[in-house]
């Protein structure tokens, strides 16, 4: 796999173990927690992200309306099972025998059940509204300026194709970003939405996942955006299942 | 196979404007993004801005601002830049670049744009 | 704006040589873009993510560096070689050029 051959490291995540024992001297980096090779050419899936950060030391942490079947990420971090090609396994389960089904961001999508519970397939998040709240301004942002910024950024930093940014909405201070990426239009290396959403959360937080890359320094004709609040709302291809005691609580 | 084949050569006078087109094939033109550059005579390259063909949201550089309109007709798969208020500085071969993941991958084959009284 | 500035400017040199052209930014940047360019054609990527090498492009070119440092390398220089090279940043608005390195026969 790619990496920097000078130094052996990881340009596209900082979670991995790297050493010169691929095919004839190769730089070959492994996921901290999986132990699982990773593509250092693009971003690393946020199955194994999700399980390097837990095996980590704990110091080391017009406007769209979502719809009714949005779904936002309130469970927090918990050590998932990947496939062998670094995906969320349907079904997820906690040491004490609590399972339940998430999407392919890995969020919860039913409620949760014990190891009788069946996932017959990963869903898709095939939507993602990313809302965020910029601090105050001396005065509201140039839209066009502002919406082109952005998908520069989602474009070269996340190598997310351009057709999956389906829009940017500006009502300030709040900014949407609409991602969007059916499964018949994902073709063989292309960047996942949830991966790249994943990415630019962890910018915003300041706990850029790049190895050697300054943090995310977002500028608007050289004006400063700054992040105050975000919230991701995730949408599946098939609508989550949950009980009506969770949905009238 | 991927063309961007651009109009031909222009002659202006000073204070005219001109308008040069590129029109795709061998690709979903709304799914990418087509900039433009120049490049002078006997000089280096220059980017003038870029235009995302899907929402058509636009970015132009700031020393055009003003003077530069990217327009794109998804009918045709045609891009458009027009720059207004010429003068003989803006003498070039003017290129169209398609964009992706990649800041240009193909380019337009350019247009020279002369600009003399 | 990103200043690249390139070393040197021209160059001169036979068919065979190794030849290095560098790319100095004013700021870091993440990845560095090169282009080939010959007369009268428009230019063609030749690097990507400072170094890999674009479709087609013949592994006797390669890049590297990180940061604001930028390397473009030729192991054997070959006839169809002779052109002009850019590098080109994309890591800010506006996008910025080298001022491009004109490589001559010798």
């Known amino acids: 796999h790619t990496a920097a051959q000078d130094n052996c490291t990881c340009p596209t995540n900082k979670m991995t173990v790297c050493s010169p024992d691929g095919p004839g001297g190769r730089c070959q980096c492994r996921a901290l927690g999986s132990g699982m090779a990773v593509d250092c050419s693009t971003l690393t899936s946020k199955c194994l992200l999700l399980k390097a950060r837990m095996s980590a030391p704990k110091n080391a942490r017009t406007l769209v309306r979502p719809s009714e079947h949005a779904l936002v990420d309130n469970d927090g971090l918990y050590d998932p099972d990947c496939d062998p090609e670094g995906r969320f396994k349907a079904r997820q389960c906690n040491q004490t025998s609590v399972c339940w089904c998430v999407n392919s961001v890995g969020v919860r999508r039913t409620d949760k059940g014990d190891l009788s519970l069946r996932c017959d397939e990963l869903v898709r998040t095939h939507h993602i509204l990313i809302d965020l709240r910029h601090r105050p301004t001396a005065g509201a942002f140039n839209h066009s300026d502002l919406d082109a910024e952005l998908r520069r950024l989602f474009r070269e930093r996340y190598r997310l194709h351009p057709k999956f940014v389906a829009a940017v909405h500006y009502e300030q201070p709040t900014i949407q970003i609409e991602l969007r990426q059916n499964t018949s239009q994902k073709a063989a290396g292309d960047v996942d939405i949830g991966d790249a959403a994943y990415y630019f959360e962890r910018d915003i937080k300041g706990e850029s996942l790049f190895q050697g890359r300054g943090g995310l320094d977002l500028r608007v004709r050289g004006e400063p955006l700054q992040v105050e609040r975000t919230l991701i709302y995730y949408l599946d291809e098939i609508p989550p299942k949950f009980s009506m005691k969770r949905l009238t609580a | 196979e991927v063309q961007l084949v651009q109009s031909g050569p222009e002659v202006k006078k000073p204070g005219a404007s001109v308008k040069v087109s590129c029109k795709a094939s061998?690709?979903?033109?709304?799914?990418?993004?087509i900039g433009w550059v120049r490049q002078a005579p006997g000089q280096g390259l220059e980017w003038i801005g870029e235009?995302?063909?899907?929402?058509?949201?636009?970015y132009y550089a700031e020393k055009f601002k003003g003077r530069v309109t990217m327009t794109a007709d998804t009918s045709t798969s045609t891009a458009y830049m027009e720059l207004s208020s010429l003068r003989s500085e803006d003498t070039a071969v003017y290129y169209c670049?398609?964009?992706?993941?990649?800041?240009?991958?193909?380019w337009g084959q350019g247009t020279l744009v002369t600009v003399s009284s | 704006d990103i200043q690249l500035t390139q070393s040197p400017s021209s160059l001169s040199a036979s068919v065979g040589d190794r030849v290095t052209i560098t790319c100095s930014a004013s700021s870091s940047v993440s990845y560095m873009y090169w282009y080939q360019q010959k007369p009268g054609k428009a230019p063609k990527l030749l690097i990507y993510d400072t170094s890999t090498l674009a479709s087609g492009v013949p592994s006797r070119f390669s890049g590297s560096g990180s940061g604001t440092d930028f390397t473009l390398t030729i192991s054997s220089l070959q006839p169809e070689d002779f052109a002009t090279y850019y590098c080109q940043q994309w890591s800010s608005y506006p996008y910025t050029f080298g001022q491009g390195t004109k490589l001559e026969i010798k």
């Open positions: 061998g690709f979903t033109f709304t799914d990418y993004v």
């Open positions: 235009i995302y063909l899907g929402s058509g949201t636009i």
């Open positions: 670049a398609r964009g992706s993941i990649f800041p240009f991958d193909y």
